[in-house]
Structures are given as C-alpha cells and as structure tokens.
C-alpha cells in the first residue's frame, strides 16, 4: 500500500530565539512512500504495524512502542510439584511375570493394594498427591515407583516441597522397618524388606519470578525487580506507584530509559521543578527555592 | 472379575467333620491365591489357612494345624477345607478369600474378592 505523507511549512522558536523554517514542499506533489508492513518503522523496538496500529512487545507500548510499561505480567504457576523416584522390596508378594504386564489383572490388583497401602503410609503429608509405579522387577518384588507431591504456589514453595520429601523419606523408611515379615508370614497390608527402600532422585519444580522478571523486562532488566503482595510476585518499574520500590517523583513523571528510572519535571504556572526527584522549586517571580 | 461362591456350612457335633467348598471364576491365570477366614460373633475376621494353586505355599492357623486341610482343585478352580475334630470355637461364618497375585499375608485387607460366606456351627 502507498501512504501520502502530508508535508507544510513549520515554524519553531529554538532557545537561542532564531527562527528555523523547515524545507516547503509543493503540496500539489503528493509524497509518496511504500510501505513494508510496519508503517515506515512507525513501531518501534520490534513492534509492528497491524494496519491499524503497532502491536509493542514487552515491555514497550504506546503509539510507536516507544515508551516502557511500569510493570509486566509475570505468571507463577498455580501449583508447583515435586516428584520422587523411590524404591522398595516388598516381601509379602511373590514375584510373576505377570506382573510386568501393566495391563495384567495381576499388576493391576498389586498396583491398587500398593497405592491403598502408601496412601495410608503418607496420609498425614499434605502436599502427597499419589504414587505411580513405573517398574516391578523380581527380588520379591522390587516397586519402582514416583511419590507426587504438590502444592499452592508461594514464595516459599521450595523450603515446603522439601520439607515434605524430608518426611516422605522419614515415613517410608519407617513403615519398612516396621511392616516385616514374621515366620515368613506378614500380619499387614503389606510387608517389605528393610534394606530395600532406597531414594533414587528427587525433581522440584523450577519457577523463579525474577528470572522471568528479568527476561520479560528485556535490555530493562537491571531496573526491573520483584515485590510480592498477598504472597503473590510482581514485577514492576521504579515508576510502578504503591510499592517499596516505587520512585517517588514528587512535581513530576517518572519514565524508563536505558539508564534507569528518572523523574520527568513539570512546570506549573508559578514554579518550575527540579533535582532528581522533582522536589526543588523554584517560585516563577522570585528566584528562591522550597524544599 | 472374579467370583467365589462358597457351600458346605452346616451344624455338626464337636468332634465331627465337614467340608467347605469354593467355586472360583473370572480368573486370567492358574496361578493365584485362595484362602478360607472365619468370624465368630463379635470378634474380628482371622484367617484360617491359605494355598497357592501353583501348590507352591500353604498356610495353617496354629489354632487348626493337624486339623484343617486346605486344597485346590485345579481342573475345578475349586478350593476346599477339610475340617475334622471340630470344636465350639470354631464356630463361625467362614469366607472363602482370593487374589490374583502369589500373598503370603494373614491381614484380611490384602485379599480382594471376598464370597458371601456360609456358617459353620458346631454344638451339641
């Protein structure tokens, strides 16, 4: 598409009081430009045209992308989870090869009694969700399996998902200590061999919204930091009002740029504003200062 | 999925026999689990003997050994208990119990299919 960019003669006061005229056009002579999508580079920092107006990318917006947004949306995840890859021998079970078949009625009735017997092993935790078993194997019956644990999403979700593997561990060695087979019966649900329980791994949920912070803020990302309110993260400019990091402008407007946070001072009919935070000034007719 | 249907119960004299039966059906293997519990009045449900129908592991309660005989017939998918020298504490309902997997547990919880159950009385 061809845009027409209407030209005319302008006239502007520099501070020095020279008048600068700019170049007249005929008017008659319509310009022209071909456009390439982005109306002319009217988007700026990466924004594009939509043909209606520029699409920004975080963490620009405005007309032509031009200015930085004072917060950016940051999504931590609702819930956050920990799986446990563990091992134990269970003893009361002997071993068939049925019981690779995971489809088998055999693997499907051990699988019900071993969830029905963790179930009650980890009933006081929580953040338990379940087991799923990923492998039997002889030797009675050696259960790999995961422990799934979960929960809300907070600041501190990582010291809980630890703390709850902790007791995981705790209550798992307990009960295979304890439920063991006795003249080669077993009086429990299920019965296991002591020295069969082992921890293989353990995988926490990786969420960090600073990092998220700093990789949505861009070539901002040392002015941009997380606060949290209601234990909830945000990521916000110094020009995000209401937090303990908000810049406080005082007479003026507090704008990004490249080197960080500045106030933006305005004048008022009877003062002008300056200093850093916009907290000096200067009364119009007499030439002295509040503070 | 499996089904067990028990018969045999009745009254007898102390000192008599009788023989209980189980009809199983619904298995996908011949190998599994039977077992025989009983229950008096008011107490809880203990087992009394088990059997692999691979003939692989049999169970007596100290309380019936030498007196009990569990067996499996596996042409059947029948299992029986021989009962002799019976007394007025082993009166009770007795349940025929099975699983699918090789147990080697007294604990009623770990057995899955469950009869109906038929009472044994032995008095006087």
């Known amino acids: 598409p061809l845009a027409t960019i209407p030209v005319s003669t302008t006239s502007l006061t520099s501070s020095e009081g020279s008048t600068i005229s700019t170049p007249s056009v005929d008017i008659s002579t319509p310009v022209t430009t071909s456009i390439v999508g982005d109306q002319c580079s009217r988007c700026k920092n990466g924004g594009f045209w939509d043909g209606l107006k520029c699409q920004c990318l975080t963490p620009y917006y405005g007309e032509s992308c031009e200015e930085v947004v004072n917060s950016i949306d940051i999504a931590p995840p609702e819930t956050v989870s920990a799986q446990m890859e563990l091992t134990v021998t269970v003893t009361s079970v002997k071993f068939t090869d049925e019981l690779k078949n995971h489809s088998s009625q055999e693997f499907r009735e051990f699988n019900k009694t071993f969830t029905e017997q963790m179930n009650i092993v980890y009933s006081g935790i929580p953040e338990y969700v379940g087991v799923n078993i990923t492998n039997l194997r002889l030797g009675s019956v050696v259960v790999e399996h995961d422990v799934l644990l979960r929960t809300k999403y907070t600041p501190e979700y990582k010291t809980a998902l630890d703390n709850a593997t902790e007791v995981v561990k705790q209550k798992i060695t307990k009960v295979t200590t304890e439920q063991i087979m006795t003249n080669d019966n077993c009086s429990a649900l299920m019965c296991f061999n002591t020295t069969g329980t082992q921890v293989q791994n353990i995988t926490v949920t990786q969420y960090d919204p600073v990092e998220e912070c700093r990789q949505k803020a861009e070539e901002y990302e040392d002015y941009f930091l997380v606060e949290y309110r209601d234990q909830k993260p945000y990521c916000i400019s110094p020009c995000e009002s209401g937090f303990n990091a908000s810049k406080n402008c005082n007479h003026g407007k507090c704008q990004m740029s490249q080197n960080g946070a500045r106030c933006l001072c305005v004048t008022t009919e009877t003062h002008w504003y300056s200093g850093e935070d916009c907290n000096q000034g200067t009364q119009k007719s007499h030439h002295h200062h509040h503070h | 999925d499996v089904q067990l249907v028990e018969s045999g119960g009745g009254v007898v004299q102390p000192g008599g026999s009788l023989r209980l039966s189980c009809a199983a059906s619904g298995y996908t293997s011949n190998r599994y689990s039977m077992a025989w519990f009983r229950q008096a009045p008011g107490k809880e449900r203990e087992v009394v003997a088990f059997?692999?129908?691979?003939?692989?592991?049999?169970y007596y309660a100290d309380s019936v050994k030498g007196r009990f005989t569990i067996s499996h017939d596996n042409a059947k998918n029948t299992l029986y208990l021989q009962m002799n020298s019976l007394r007025a504490e082993d009166t009770a309902v007795y349940y025929c119990?099975?699983?699918?997997?090789?147990?080697?547990?007294?604990?009623?919880?770990?057995?899955?299919?469950w009869g109906q159950g038929t009472m044994v009385t032995v008095s006087s």
């Open positions: 059997i692999w129908t691979d003939g692989g592991r049999t």
């Open positions: 119990a099975a699983s699918s997997l090789l147990l080697q547990t007294i604990n009623p919880r770990a057995w899955p299919y």
